[in-house]
Interface confidence: low
């Protein structure tokens, strides 16, 4: 066949024309309302779209292309019918029509039909499985953007909970900063307050220090002055010797006087000697002087001197070895020293009084009827029982007795170095109530200290003493 | 503003016990010395309990030896007094205070202790 046109009729037939040489054949065939026309011709590749669809969008498709599988069936089937109507009707009039050779163009004309028939069936088959295969595709896209959903979702819900520890954990962080920084802030103050004592007593050494200094140079003068007197006394006393020995001769009544030793001012009382001053003291059995001060008038006399504070001229942050052997000025400032003390009180029983006057003019004392010192091998550890006084009703020397505690030699029940914080060699505990050995503070400087010179029980804890006189006595005087 | 409150007092039969709370604002405790003060009405007040700020040494009144336990939790700014074996002569007001001058004394006399909170009753009776 030579050509084969397709037009539209009035009543919405399509209208097929064959020309075959000399003759031309007309078929009219329903259109389907439905079906895709030739002007927007179909792409069969238009569904396989590698990027995923919107879900809605692939339903309206999948929809649009099962009604046009429907229609284009039933268009086959309708058409499939409509031939074999014709093909009978036509045959009849070729039959009585038509020359008999015109049976063979119709023949060709109805196999033309049949093979496009075909052909559009082949084509349908091709759209199905096309649709079938993207409608899996679109299903696993479905399938696998759910899985992605709840995947995220629990992403979403897992970040939350961690920003909502994060949140709490930063708000903890952000109040114990704070409570930090109070604490510091307090911790500071603190610091400064003992950064501007310590400055105070930095200046106070400063003047001492250049006050001794002035002193030392006065004491080189005074001391080549004493050394002129001394030769000169030295003299005077051979001379005395000489003469007594040359009158001893011519007089032999006169008795060479004995030298006499006290062990404790008590002794030097009995022995007739009732004047406060400094007296040389020797124990029995041995050879070693210590000079002590004597009050020979307060509540009866007889009180051996062991320590002193009233002026803050003596330093007395010392070492164990000072404290051993004593240091100071007796008529002044000083310590007796712990091995003559623990030596005395252990040869017989003796009372400690401890006379105490704050900067407001008042005094109180404190006396223990028995008191001694253990050796140095028990690190001179106080005993002290029966406390009577108005210096407090409870014993400021912490009981029982601790061991004596100095800068080098730390024996207190503290983690800390009381003797180094607090200064001075006491009998320290935790550190205790008491530490007479403590800084001197002058007035007006005198509170709000902890390393000053305390007696708890009287004063309180910050309160540093004016003056402290500690003495001892036979407890039978 | 720095303040000192005491809590768990209450009525409670002889044999008893009882825990007492003493939580600081405003400052920290660490470096306070603490006290346990009691005052029974008409009568001078007592030190129960003291413990230090750097060592945690501790100070009982005789009267109290063994039946209480003084502690300090510096984490929590808290002192607390755990009282066993109460017996009716424990009945008080018990008051908590901190000394700031000392240190680290332990002396229970209450002398020197510049805050003191608003004191808890402790009742000990059948």
């Known amino acids: 066949y030579n050509n084969f046109r397709k037009s539209m009729d009035s009543i919405g037939k399509k209208q097929y024309q064959v020309q075959h040489g000399s003759c031309s054949y007309t078929f009219l065939l329903p259109e389907m309302d439905n079906c895709r026309s030739s002007s927007s011709p179909y792409v069969s590749n238009a569904v396989q779209r590698d990027a995923p669809l919107e879900y809605d969008d692939s339903v309206q498709r999948l929809q649009v292309l099962e009604n046009i599988m429907e229609n284009n069936t039933q268009w086959l089937m309708k058409l499939e019918n409509y031939i074999q109507d014709n093909m009978k009707k036509e045959m009849v009039e070729i039959q009585q029509n038509a020359v008999q050779n015109q049976t063979a163009v119709m023949i060709e004309v109805v196999t033309n039909l049949l093979n496009q028939t075909a052909e559009q069936t082949r084509k349908l088959t091709d759209v199905e499985a096309q649709v079938l295969n993207q409608t899996t595709r679109l299903e696993l896209q479905l399938l696998e953007h759910s899985l992605s959903t709840n995947k995220l979702e629990k992403q979403i819900l897992d970040q939350t909970s961690e920003i909502n520890k994060l949140q709490d954990k930063n708000s903890f962080l952000e109040k114990k900063v704070l409570a930090m920084e109070d604490k510091h802030i307090i911790q500071l103050q603190s610091i400064k307050e003992e950064k501007d004592q310590l400055q105070v007593l930095v200046s106070k050494q400063n003047s001492i220090i250049e006050e001794l200094e002035k002193k030392i140079v006065t004491a080189t003068v005074n001391n080549s002055v004493l050394q002129k007197q001394q030769h000169d006394l030295m003299e005077t006393v051979n001379n005395l010797l000489t003469m007594m020995s040359t009158s001893n001769s011519k007089d032999p009544t006169v008795a060479k006087e004995e030298q006499i030793s006290f062990r404790d001012c008590a002794e030097v009382f009995k022995s007739g000697h009732t004047t406060n001053g400094v007296y040389t003291l020797t124990l029995p059995n041995s050879t070693e002087e210590v000079k002590a001060y004597c009050d020979m008038e307060a509540g009866g006399g007889g009180w051996t001197i062991i320590q002193r504070r009233e002026d803050g001229s003596v330093d007395f942050q010392r070492t164990w070895k000072e404290y051993k052997v004593g240091f100071g000025n007796p008529s002044g400032e000083y310590w007796l020293g712990n091995e003559f003390v623990s030596q005395l009180t252990n040869q017989q029983r003796y009372v400690l009084k401890i006379h105490l006057k704050d900067w407001e003019g008042n005094e109180a004392y404190s006396l223990y009827e028995h008191f001694y010192l253990s050796s140095e091998e028990l690190n001179y550890r106080i005993h002290l029982k029966g406390l009577t006084g108005t210096a407090g009703k409870i014993s400021s020397i912490s009981q029982p007795g601790n061991d004596f505690s100095t800068k080098d030699a730390d024996n207190d029940k503290c983690i800390c170095k009381c003797s180094q914080m607090l200064t001075g060699g006491w009998w320290f505990d935790a550190c205790g109530p008491s530490n007479l050995n403590g800084m001197y503070y002058p007035q007006r400087q005198n509170t709000n200290k902890f390393n000053g010179i305390k007696w708890y029980y009287w004063k309180g804890s910050g309160y540093s003493l004016k003056g402290t006189t500690m003495m001892i006595r036979p407890a039978d005087f | 503003e720095v303040q000192l409150v005491e809590s768990g007092g209450g009525l409670v039969q002889p044999g008893g016990s009882l825990r007492l709370s003493c939580a600081a604002s405003g400052f920290a405790l660490d470096y306070y010395a603490i006290g346990w003060f009691r005052q029974v009405p008409g009568k001078e007040r007592e030190g129960v309990s003291c413990?230090?700020?750097?060592?945690?040494?501790?100070y009982y009144v005789d009267s109290v030896k063994g039946r209480f336990t003084i502690s300090r939790d510096n984490a929590k700014n808290t002192v607390y007094l755990q009282m066993n074996s109460l017996k009716p002569e424990d009945t008080a007001v018990y008051y908590c205070?901190?000394?700031?001058?000392?240190?680290?004394?332990?002396?229970?006399?209450?002398?020197?202790?510049?805050?003191w909170g608003q004191g808890t009753q402790v009742t000990v009776s059948s």
């Open positions: 205070a901190t000394d700031s001058g000392g240190y680290i004394d332990y002396d229970c006399m209450g002398l020197g202790y510049d805050y």
């Open positions: 413990i230090s700020s750097s060592d945690g040494i501790t």
